[in-house]
């Protein structure tokens, strides 16, 4: 199976961790599949929920992925780049705040450029409840990590804000920032940020980034 949509269509309709393999590749990755939300078939490419995993990682770690697919993890830029360049994918970002609210941003077309182009993010067609303007800057930026500064700032956004992300200068979002527990989650410049939902300084309780083929 190349993604969770294929897993779903094969008859496996239970949430859980599945092994995925890209066509013409022997390399396997373990990904969490959400088979319930919005019709199922979602491949989870990022999840934050409790601060149990350190997201201040190197370029190589963000490339290959890290964490626990059943909990907090990053699937890996290389796999996502290859997958999203084979067909059109949508990206859904699900967010939770500390007051019990949930929101989402859905992009009609999402893909990552290759590593040679620094896994630049490409997004089109925003809808959803987490802001009328995209909190991931458009046009998309290159990916940056603590050891690979590809942002548009004279500062080093990844070091300053922590975590790897498609930083602008530094931009209105960072879902891979520091995890702050409840009552410590406000006025944090380096937290888990989605500006056009919660504004400046608010660090979110939970985030999930998930992809699925368009027209699934």
């Amino acid at each position: 199976f190349r993604d969770c949509a294929e897993v779903f269509k094969s008859g496996h309709t239970t949430n859980g961790v599945y092994t995925l393999t890209l066509p013409n590749s022997t390399e396997e990755v373990k990904a969490y599949c959400d088979m319930e939300a919005g019709g199922g078939g979602w491949t989870i490419i990022q999840r934050r929920e409790d601060g149990s995993v350190d997201f201040q990682r190197t370029w190589k770690e963000y490339k290959v992925g890290f964490g626990n697919p059943s909990g907090e993890y990053w699937l890996g830029n290389e796999f996502v780049s290859q997958l999203t360049n084979q067909q059109r994918y949508v990206l859904k970002i699900h967010l939770k705040d500390w007051e019990g609210n949930e929101a989402y941003s859905l992009y009609e077309h999402f893909y990552l450029s290759s590593e040679e182009l620094n896994y630049r993010i490409h997004l089109k067609g925003l809808t959803g409840t987490a802001g009328k303007i995209s909190s991931i800057s458009q046009p998309g930026n290159d990916f940056s990590t603590k050891d690979a500064d590809n942002d548009k700032c004279i500062c080093k956004c990844s070091q300053m804000l922590t975590g790897g992300w498609w930083f602008d200068a530094c931009g209105p979002s960072n879902l891979n920032g520091m995890y702050y527990p409840q009552r410590q989650n406000t006025n944090k410049f380096n937290g888990i940020k989605w500006y056009y939902w919660k504004g400046s300084g608010y660090s979110l309780k939970g985030t999930t980034m998930m992809i699925r083929p368009a027209g699934f």
């Epitope: 997004l123 067609g125 009328k132 303007i133």
Partner: antibody, heavy 115, light 107 residues
């Protein structure tokens, strides 16, 4: 913004026609787009908007029958066809991304209607 | 069409001053109001939307407030680069309509 670039403006006689173009970055493919105009020394006036696939069009009632909005997503281009032009249509015409409000604007193209 | 009555049409102020611009809609607008800044020869720039939500890159001295029919743009401490014309816009109803603008000039 280099992501929205208008062209096609110029001098036209009253009663004449003009087609304005707006070359858009491809990330606007799924977005509503609008035309907004501004007469010299005056305020902003919304002309109309068009949905991503061009299936929904909204035109300010004062332009119905004279102006038409269209788009060609294969060319990443937005158009404003203006017919029966009048002196009072003299303005800078901007294309903009329409989220209800306008968060991306082109640099504008000047249309002058004069005999 | 909804009429957006913007006041004042112009004002003179000094650097450091607090500036307030108001817009009154002819009908209930549900906070679907935006504010723009425009400098001569340039396209407008979005500052505020949904009545009070500041665009990320916009300095914190700009703020929006209001409800129902009445909305306000405030510049808490005017800076040299803030001298420009400001417009409100309602997007609750078609046709979208703008206020006539407020020109902020140097005193």
């Amino acid at each position: 913004s280099e992501h929205l670039v208008e062209s096609g403006g110029g001098l036209v006689k009253p009663g004449g026609s003009l087609r304005l173009s707006c070359a858009t970055a491809d990330f606007f493919e799924y977005d509503d787009m609008s035309w907004v105009r501004q007469a010299p020394g005056k305020g902003l006036e919304w002309v109309g908007s068009i949905s991503p696939k061009g299936d929904h069009k909204y035109l300010n009632t004062k332009f119905i029958g004279r102006f038409t909005i269209s788009r060609d997503d294969s060319k990443n281009t937005l158009y404003l066809q203006m017919n029966s032009l009048r002196a009072e249509d003299t303005a800078v015409y901007y294309c903009a991304r329409d989220v209800g409000f306008f968060d991306w604007w082109g640099q504008g193209t000047l249309v002058t209607v004069s005999s | 069409a909804i009429y957006m009555h913007q006041e004042p049409s112009s004002l003179s102020a000094s650097v450091g001053d607090r500036v307030t611009i108001t817009c009154h809609g002819s009908y209930w607008l549900n906070s679907e109001v935006a504010w723009y800044q425009q400098k001569p020869g340039k396209a407008p720039k979005l500052l505020i939307f949904d009545g009070d939500f500041k665009v990320y890159e916009v300095p914190s001295r700009f703020s929006g407030s209001g409800s129902h029919e009445d909305y306000t743009l405030t510049i808490s401490s005017l800076q040299p680069e803030d001298f420009a014309t400001y417009y409100c816009q309602q997007y609750r109803y078609h046709p979208y309509t703008f206020g006539h603008g407020t020109k902020v000039e140097i005193k």
